[in-house]
Interface confidence: low
């Protein structure tokens, strides 16, 4: 197999890598590399990530921390978890809103925007599935309402004239 192999580090523990002249111990999560070690198997100089930056993993080479992401207010996102030295901001949607992915194959890192959940009650419909990671799913019309076009219309209360089948209990019509 071609190519050069990095020299093996014969140090106790496995958190050592060749940095410059020597095998050095890496920096823990939340710290960046200020300077490599000055002796074999020594400790690198590591500094804590400044405010609003983070590094999620232990590392041997990052000389600066990553900037924390800002949640996209234009997309109605909110911070579910604030950024720390070891973790990026976790953006999501506030209660009553759900995530609408902006790409077809959605993964956790995909861009998204927040949509308000459908209020089935305001549409006079049953709630079939509550809004969480997907929109509310509304069912058929609530008692006292019937399907008309795309909406639910209040049942007539008079026994005169026609009474839609779903309104039998309201306007007294029976089959």
């Amino acid at each position: 197999q071609g190519g050069t192999r990095s020299p093996r580090c014969d140090c106790a523990g496995d958190f050592h890598k060749k940095i410059g002249l020597f095998c050095c111990r890496g920096c823990p999560a939340g710290h960046y590399l200020k300077a490599p070690c000055t002796e074999p198997c020594g400790n690198s100089t590591c500094l804590v990530c400044p405010q609003d930056t983070f590094l999620a993993w232990e590392n041997h080479h990052n000389s600066e921390c990553a900037r924390c992401q800002a949640c996209d207010e234009q997309a109605s996102q909110v911070a579910l978890e604030n950024c720390s030295a070891v973790a990026d901001t976790r953006c999501g949607c506030k209660p009553g809103w759900f995530v609408e992915c902006q790409v077809s194959q959605c993964v956790s890192s995909s861009p998204f925007y927040c949509q308000p959940c459908l209020d089935c009650g305001a549409l006079h419909r049953h709630t079939r599935l509550l809004c969480s990671r997907r929109d509310t799913d509304c069912g058929t019309c609530l008692p006292g309402f019937y399907e008309h076009g795309d909406g639910c219309v209040s049942c007539p209360t008079s026994t005169l004239g026609s009474c839609p089948e779903r309104c039998a209990a309201v306007c007294g019509w029976r089959q």
């Epitope: 992915c101 049953h126 079939r128 997907r134 929109d135 799913d137 069912g139 058929t140 399907e147």
Partner: antibody, heavy 121, light 115 residues
């Protein structure tokens, strides 16, 4: 007695179109959401498309989105599936299936006997 | 897309019993599924819906020999006193919404052979 009877299947060439129909009887058609589900020979069930009781909500599987169109005529107790730009992988038995009127749950409680679609050159 | 996993086959002796499993992907462990029976060259038939708490409701004409239960992400269909007409493929299915898109996903089916 609830009945769903599909028709319109047959042999078609790739790129051609077919329209499937499903005629319903024995229940109040306009109260129910409806679905098309297909089954390739010797394979499992694959959901194709959904339409709500008043056509206000329509959804498609990724494999057919942009090529198939689901519609219904509540006055005629009929459900339709317009299939355009057919591909060989659309070869399957196509079933229409009824979603029960409000149960608070998802189910497909009655199925038609199916209509066979074969796409081959 | 949600994932429902079923083993491909199971066998049961006449008058014996068999228990079929449908496993949901972990994030859906509280979702309701539906069991369907499909006899050879026939349309699927609704057997029951089955909630995460084990409560279930059977379709018209489904005998008492069929029952459902749940444990975590697993949904079970049990058939006791198995009869020859139970020889069929059993699918689990689940309706779901993702954003505004409604859909169904099905397991690959378990073929039950009555010996």
């Amino acid at each position: 007695e609830v009945q769903l009877v599909e028709s319109g299947g047959g042999l078609s060439q790739p790129g051609n179109s077919l329209q499937l129909s499903c005629e319903a009887s024995g229940f109040t058609f306009s109260n129910h959401d409806l679905n098309w589900v297909r089954q390739a020979p010797g394979k499992g069930l694959e959901w194709v498309a959904y339409i709500s009781s008043a056509s206000g909500l329509i959804s498609y599987a990724d494999a057919v989105r942009g090529r198939f169109t689901i519609s219904r005529d509540n006055a005629k107790n009929s459900l339709f599936l317009q299939m355009n730009n057919l591909k060989s992988e659309d070869t399957a038995m196509y079933y229409c299936a009824r979603d029960p009127a409000y149960t608070g749950l998802y189910a497909l409680d009655f199925w038609g006997q199916g209509t066979q679609v074969t796409v081959s050159s | 897309q949600p994932v429902l996993t079923q083993s491909p086959s199971a066998s049961a002796s006449l008058s014996g019993s068999v228990k079929l499993t449908c496993t949901l992907s972990s994030e859906l462990s509280n979702f309701t599924i539906v069991w369907y029976q499909q006899r050879p060259d026939k349309a699927p038939k609704y057997v029951m819906y089955l909630k995460s708490d084990g409560s279930h409701s059977k379709g018209d004409g489904i005998p008492d020999r069929f029952s459902g239960s749940s444990s975590g992400a697993h949904r079970y269909l049990s058939i006791s006193n198995v009869q020859s007409e139970d020889d069929a493929t059993y699918f689990c299915g689940m309706g779901y919404t993702l954003a505004n898109q409604y859909g169904w996903v099905f397991g690959s089916g378990t073929k039950v052979t009555v010996l």
